[in-house]
């Protein structure tokens, strides 16, 4: 767990507290929150960066996904429980002993209950599709310019393999970015998509979470790329367990 | 143990095109692992021309974008080099090499081989 | 493109010494830079990734460390086999990876 050495910050999170602690005095961070070490080479999970932001909520995302499956966030801002890897625990509850089950970015995918609800896996989001609307430009951006640069950013600021962006979608004003992992196609050391696609999100809201880096700055050919609105559609390996009342 | 070997002419005619083949052994080329060629003229410094991910589009150094070419056949497990309009200046060994991580550094290179633009 | 400049070009050292070989880049990397040792002759091979982290088979003499613009390889103890050239390379930016101009380790 080592971070910037020059001035002891971790450039892949602010939301962090470093000191020369580590061993051989090297920089160690550790997440606000829940004072977890992160490795500052990588992305900080999710879990860890909700935890950590608790202490300043901003509004509530909307998470929806358009299939008889949708998951629609409308929870807001929780202070969720991480395990020791930093990911969500199947189980959240909150302080007033409602519980609930969620999917690994955190997303709730049961009814709410009481302490005795289980949750016996974490279920994994294997499929995230990001609907962005950008800001009306002169002409359409071509679709393979598009596509080039969005992998791009992946790949660089995210350090997401570009197997696990399936496919960008575009028809002005629309764009739509696919990112696919499987369980099983998820190696050690590699991104979660579910992590990247929150990185990203954060960023075209302008709130992004690297250490004094500009912010994004998305460009497709010179001409800028300006989101205007973000929607982040979920599927989960297993479909959530709602009861027909929340369906009607 | 992964090796790789390049294969091809050793002179190739002004304004003609360098066609070299890097073959791998040890490894399969459908794997985690992005596959480069990378060149350094005589005495100078080394120079990264571009990558390939099986299944996935290949990258190019913008500086030789126009002229480059690189592709994968898995059914031999080899990638090749295609490199048009050369001049003299193109001269020079060319390895290929095995990119790891997300970002390519290349933790297996081929021996290299020496290609010489003359007429 | 990320610029990668290395100091000094050509250095001289005898077995036993302890050098210092500096690279930095254009803009941060934050910890994507590897460092390579060339022979005459041969291919290149990679001794550190990641800034710091040893490749495997590689002697614990090598050491790598800087994070941001500025890097540094250091050979604690110059062994025969150490007089080369070497090379880091940034892997921060695929468009393009960039490589600096190498670094000579010759026998003074």
């Known amino acids: 767990h080592t971070a910037a050495q020059d001035n002891c910050t971790c450039p892949t999170n602010k939301m962090t507290v470093c000191s020369p602690d580590g061993p051989g005095g090297r920089c160690q961070c550790r997440a606000l929150g829940s004072g977890v070490a992160v490795d500052c080479s990588t992305l900080t999970s999710e879990c860890l960066l909700l935890k950590a932001r608790m202490s300043a909520p901003k509004n509530a995302r909307t998470l929806v996904r358009p299939n008889e499956h949708a998951l629609v966030d409308n929870d807001g801002l929780y202070d969720p429980d991480c395990d020791p890897e930093g990911r969500f625990k199947a189980r959240q509850c909150n302080q007033t002993s409602v519980c609930w089950c969620v999917n690994s970015v955190g997303v709730r995918r049961t009814d709410k209950g009481d302490l005795s609800l289980r949750c016996d896996e974490l279920v994994r989001t294997h499929h995230i599709l990001i609907d962005l609307r950008h800001r009306p430009t002169a002409g359409a951006f071509n679709h393979s310019d598009l596509d080039a640069e969005l992998r791009r950013l992946f790949r660089e600021r995210y350090r997401l393999h570009p197997k696990f962006v399936a496919a960008v979608h575009y028809e002005q004003p629309t764009i739509q970015i696919e990112l696919r992992q499987n369980t099983s196609q998820k190696a050690a050391g590699d991104v979660d998509i579910g992590d990247a696609a929150y990185y990203f999100e954060r960023d075209v809201k302008g709130e992004s979470l690297f250490q004094g880096r500009g912010g994004l700055d998305l460009r497709v050919r010179g001409e800028p790329l300006q989101v205007e609105r973000t929607l982040i559609y979920y599927l989960d390996e297993i479909p959530p367990k709602f009861s027909m009342k929340r369906l009607t | 143990q992964v090796q790789l070997q390049e294969s091809g002419p050793g002179l190739v005619k002004p304004s003609g095109t360098l066609s070299l083949t890097c073959a791998v052994s040890?490894?399969?080329?459908?794997?985690?692992?992005?596959w480069s060629w990378v060149r350094q003229p005589p005495g100078k410094g080394l120079e990264w021309i571009g990558e390939i991910y099986p299944g996935g589009n290949p990258n190019y150094n913008p500086s030789l974008k126009s002229r480059v070419t690189i592709s994968v056949d898995k059914s031999k497990n080899q990638f090749s080099l295609k490199l048009n309009s050369v001049t003299a200046a193109d001269t020079a060994v060319y390895y290929c090499?095995?990119?790891?991580?997300?970002?390519?550094?290349?933790?297996?290179w081929g021996q290299g081989t020496l290609v010489t633009v003359s007429s | 493109d990320i610029q990668m400049t290395q100091s000094p070009s050509t250095l001289s050292a005898s077995v036993g010494d302890r050098v210092t070989i500096t690279c930095r880049a254009s803009q941060s990397i934050g910890h994507w830079l590897a460092w390579y040792q060339q022979k005459p002759g041969k291919a290149p091979k990679l001794l550190i990734y990641?800034?710091?982290s040893l490749e495997s088979g590689v002697p614990s003499r090598f050491r790598g460390s800087g994070s941001g613009t500025e890097f540094t390889l250091t050979i604690s103890s110059l062994q025969p086999d150490d007089f080369a050239t070497y090379y880091c390379?940034?892997?921060?930016?695929?468009?393009?990876?960039?490589f600096g101009q190498g670094s000579r380790l010759e026998i003074k």
């Open positions: 990641k800034a710091s």
């Open positions: 040890g490894d399969s080329i459908s794997s985690n692992n992005w």
């Open positions: 090499a095995r990119g790891s991580g997300v970002i390519s550094y290349f933790d297996y």
């Open positions: 390379q940034q892997y921060s930016s695929y468009s393009p990876i960039t």
